[in-house]
Interface confidence: low
């Protein structure tokens, strides 16, 4: 038989082969075509069967071919590729970067927000501190610096100055925010209640020698003198 | 195939040390956040301890603030819970587990304190 | 701390029947940052849902999450033999880290 394939019937790169039968040609074409001699171009988005493309990818024909325009998230000849966006290493400060369809997200460690978890958290922001309280922003906490008198996590706590019972002598003692007052008992005075009150001064006894006492006096009376003041 | 294999586990007497490691593989350990998680007999499962990619922060629970120290070695894939001071209560089924919830779990060393 | 608070502590049902697990939270989760996880006897947790309502890798379709803030829902549509187990939520929202104190799905 004579060689079918001298004329070089078969197109588009396909194999040609005689038919041993009838020594006609036979066309072995490529993937994305069809006909006798391999011209005819394959409608691969046509198909009956199924879309090529996944996930919804658009199917665009081509001569000999086809390509898929890829949804959002997807890549590859027939998007079957996840894209994986977490491949950049997007997220900061120690986040976790979980991979999502054409898109990730980023689980931030605590104390940081933000897409890319980029962004300090003001824990300072909602105020937190009372009673003037400083608030100092830290990594995932905040610390509150209290003015003199108070105390406990958010300066809630108003110290008691007069847990130490610094008022001597029964004196009552009346915390203030930022200190304490003492009410003397009858017969002391000073800022700790501490100094009897002379009673003997403006000297009330007469004819006699004043002993102070406390809120009282005594009169020792002079020879021939008697009476409470010696009159 | 990603994997965890945890080692170190055994009895060990109250006040004691014991050394955890956790062998990874099949993931890229160094871009990942290392936990370790326990279990006590019977009982439901405990945080223990967090540990960042880089090693550079850890956070700890208050159970065992102080007493254990968490640490990896990214070049060997290994995780490490260094515990000291043991109690009674330590006694539990260790995991070391991925990332800050859990995809993937070591199947578990068994620590128990006791006299 | 939050403190996650697991209902039913027991669920008694059959091979078929749909499972709802409730998980309550004493403050709101920040970013739904909510996990489930099933354990069998003797085998390590498993992870089954993230982000309060995504599937973990290979999980089956009954399984499924839901709620926000501070209840959550782990919802078996059907449950099939392998699923008896027990079930624990937890939160990587803030440390310290904290789990329920898990739901056990058993056969009635």
């Known amino acids: 038989l004579d060689d079918a394939c001298i004329s070089n019937p078969c197109h588009k790169g396909a194999l040609c082969d005689t038919n041993p039968l009838n020594g006609q040609y036979i066309c072995t074409c490529p993937q994305g075509y069809k006909g006798a001699d391999c011209t005819e171009d394959v409608d691969e988005c046509a198909m009956a069967n199924s879309n090529p493309c996944e996930h919804a990818g658009k199917c665009v024909n081509t001569d000999g071919a086809f390509h898929c325009e890829c949804l959002k998230g997807y890549a590859g000849p027939r998007c079957e590729m996840d894209i994986n966006e977490c491949h950049s290493d997007p997220c900061q400060n120690d986040a976790t970067c979980l991979d999502k369809i054409g898109g990730f997200t980023c689980l931030c460690m605590p104390g940081f927000k933000g897409v890319h978890c980029e962004l300090e958290v003001n824990e300072c922001q909602s105020n937190p501190c009372v009673n003037n309280g400083q608030c100092v922003d830290k990594v995932n906490r905040f610390q509150c610096l209290c003015p003199p008198g108070f105390t406990g996590p958010v300066c809630q706590i108003d110290i008691d100055d007069c847990s130490s019972t610094p008022c001597l002598n029964g004196a009552k003692c009346i915390d203030h925010p930022n200190g304490y007052e003492c009410q003397c008992a009858t017969g002391f005075t000073g800022i700790l209640c501490d100094e009897n009150i002379d009673n003997c001064d403006p000297d009330p006894c007469h004819h006699g020698q004043c002993q102070d006492g406390i809120d009282s006096y005594t009169c020792i009376c002079n020879p021939g003198y008697m009476g409470a003041i010696c009159s | 195939e990603v994997q965890l294999v945890e080692s170190g586990g055994g009895l060990v007497q109250p006040g004691g040390s014991l050394r955890l490691s956790c062998a990874a593989s099949?993931?890229?350990?160094?871009?990942?956040?290392m936990s370790w998680v326990r279990q006590a007999p019977g009982k439901g499962l405990e945080w223990v301890s967090v540990?960042?990619?880089?090693?550079?922060?850890?956070y700890y629970a208050d159970s065992v603030k102080g007493r254990f120290t968490i640490s990896r070695d990214n070049s060997k894939n290994t995780l490490y819970l260094q515990m000291n001071s043991l109690r009674a209560e330590d006694t539990a089924v260790y995991y070391c587990?991925?990332?800050?919830?859990?995809?993937?779990w070591g199947q578990g060393t068994l620590v128990t304190v006791s006299s | 701390d939050i403190v996650l608070t697991q209902s039913p502590a027991t669920l008694s049902l059959s091979p078929g029947e749909r499972a709802t697990l409730s998980c309550r939270a004493s403050?709101?989760?920040?970013?739904?940052?909510l996990a489930w996880y099933q354990q069998k006897p003797g085998q390590a947790p498993r992870l089954l849902i993230y982000?309060?309502?995504s599937r973990a890798t290979g999980v089956p379709a009954r399984f499924s999450g839901s709620g926000s803030g501070t209840d959550f829902t782990l919802t078996i549509s059907s449950l099939e033999p392998e699923d008896f187990a027990v079930y624990y939520c937890?939160?990587?929202?803030?440390?310290?880290?904290?789990f329920g104190q898990g739901t056990k799905v058993e056969i009635k």
């Open positions: 587990a991925r990332s800050i919830f859990y995809t993937t």
């Open positions: 099949g993931f890229t350990f160094s871009s990942s956040g």
């Open positions: 540990i960042a990619s880089s090693g550079s922060n850890t």
């Open positions: 403050q709101s989760v920040r970013s739904n940052y």
């Open positions: 982000g309060a309502s």
């Open positions: 937890q939160q990587y929202s803030n440390f310290p880290i904290t």
